[in-house]
Amino acid sequence: MRTEAQVPALQPPEPGLEGAMGHRTLVLPWVLLTLCVTAGTPEVWVQVRMEATELSSFTIRCGFLGSGSISLVTVSWGGPNGAGGTTLAVLHPERGIRQWAPARQARWETQSSISLILEGSGASSPCANTTFCCKFASFPEGSWEACGSLPPSSDPGLSAPPTPAPILRADLAGILGVSGVLLFGCVYLLHLLRRHKHRPAPRLQPSRTSPQAPRARAWAPSQASQAALHVPYATINTSCRPATLDTAHPHGGPSWWASLPTHAAHRPQGPAAWASTPIPARGSFVSVENGLYAQAGERPPHTGPGLTLFPDPRGPRAMEGPLGVR
């Protein structure tokens, strides 16, 4: 997985994909995609979209293309998690979800993908030139990270191509194991996605999916994202930065896993199952840059496969470690 890759080799479905293709054409590509993915090295994709309804609002979607079980997902902004990034959300498949301002809603979309809505105004608000990174910790493959951002002049509501575009490599054994039929299928999938890319946005249809019910298809676009496709171009202020000590909440709290309502720890049971309830409101924990650890004379704490997050009353920090904040 390259954090620098720009080649749009394979992209997650774009908003409006369902409208662009019928149900029949949706099924085959995803079956094929699943097969294509199993042959390669784990990859992470990131998609960033600016919502036109609120110009300071972003939706970040990330997914893991791999066969291992996901232990933890960490979303950060301002750079990768070990290189100056500030943690926005940590999602554990069993212990639940934790988020920090300006994150508004983080949730599991499927067992291997998540979404995060960001909003805000002032110093902590996201902007078009912000880099967002997602790191997936998976057993036994390890930790995989990718980053993406919107170009400064992006049309509101339209998503930037996922960056880095996952490039699915396969070793010789993987290649030999894939039949000609599967190879054709992968090519066909790419053809469908590319063909969709050049289609006009579909006519809007009201979403029939209640947010409280599991969705029939993981990629069904929300009403908000559908509406966003038809809002005129607007420019946004790009002078923003991640919140640091002077803009974040100054006080910590007890270990948040212990206080999570049970619904927040809902684990999706199937590939298309969605976390069915809104997660707790953003916490009042300090979200700081890595450098502050050095001042305290301590190494940035890591969290990992099992996670006991934030027992430290000072709260979580953006850590050098991959799996989350301790």
Partner: antibody, heavy 120, light 107 residues
């Protein structure tokens, strides 16, 4: 301070088994995967396998699949590796190493090693 | 399995020198390359992870670079305590594999 304290050197006879330990301290044991690595005398390092202390899941290098068994005891924050049907080829220093759980998939802290000598 | 090759098995240098140790992977490992040092007493420490990120507590005279299949570790100002054997390791696929090591000695 993160520390991995391994059990002492052992001398065993061919055909026997040995179980070595790696006691972790200074961090939450179940939050990091644990690797085991072999270093034969004067040679390079060979990855044996990895265990997730949170749930006991394991993954092995095919070469060591029938040789090593990885386990953990969460209550004592200790990882174990058992080697069976020992031969002279198994004489080596064995290290436990914590997974950094960071991109790069490095091993950020290592035990001091357990020396195993197989001799009749 | 991915093979990791450190072509130089031993290297002699003087204190204060700039030393570069190289490592090559048998396939693209996308920066999933880590560097370790092993002291004569057997102690192993992580120096660099993900090709170029410095591990906590490691002196800034150590740096890593590279991409694709070719990577290098540079010690900008060699000190006595740097005398050790250096190993590279790929974290891109399982099984994890290591280079053969480069033993650094003082002239």
């Amino acid at each position: 301070e993160v520390q991995l304290q391994q059990s002492g050197p052992v001398l065993v006879k061919p055909g026997a088994s040995v179980k070595m330990s790696c006691k972790a301290s200074g961090y939450i044991f179940t939050d990091y995967y644990m690797h085991w690595v072999k270093q034969s005398h004067g040679k390079s390092l060979e990855w044996i396998g990895i265990i997730n202390p949170y749930n006991g899941d394991t993954s092995y290098n095919q070469k060591f699949k029938d040789k090593a068994t990885l386990t953990v005891d969460k209550s004592s924050s200790t990882a174990y590796m058992e080697l069976n049907s020992l031969t002279s080829e198994d004489s080596a220093v064995y290290y436990c190493a914590r997974d950094s759980s960071n991109v790069g998939n490095a091993m950020d802290y290592w035990g001091q090693g357990t020396s195993v000598t197989v001799s009749s | 399995d991915i093979q990791m090759t450190q072509t130089t098995s031993s290297l002699s240098a003087s204190l204060g020198d700039r030393v570069t140790i190289s490592c090559r992977a048998s396939q693209d490992i996308s920066n999933y390359l880590n560097w370790y040092l092993q002291k004569p007493d057997g102690t192993i420490k992580l120096l660099i992870y993900y090709s170029s990120r410095l591990h906590s507590g490691v002196p800034s005279r150590f740096s890593g670079s590279g991409s694709g299949t070719d990577y290098s570790l540079t010690i900008s100002n060699l000190e006595q305590e740097d005398i050790a054997t250096y190993f590279c390791q790929q974290g891109y696929t399982l099984p994890r594999t290591f280079g053969g090591g480069t033993k650094l000695e003082i002239i």
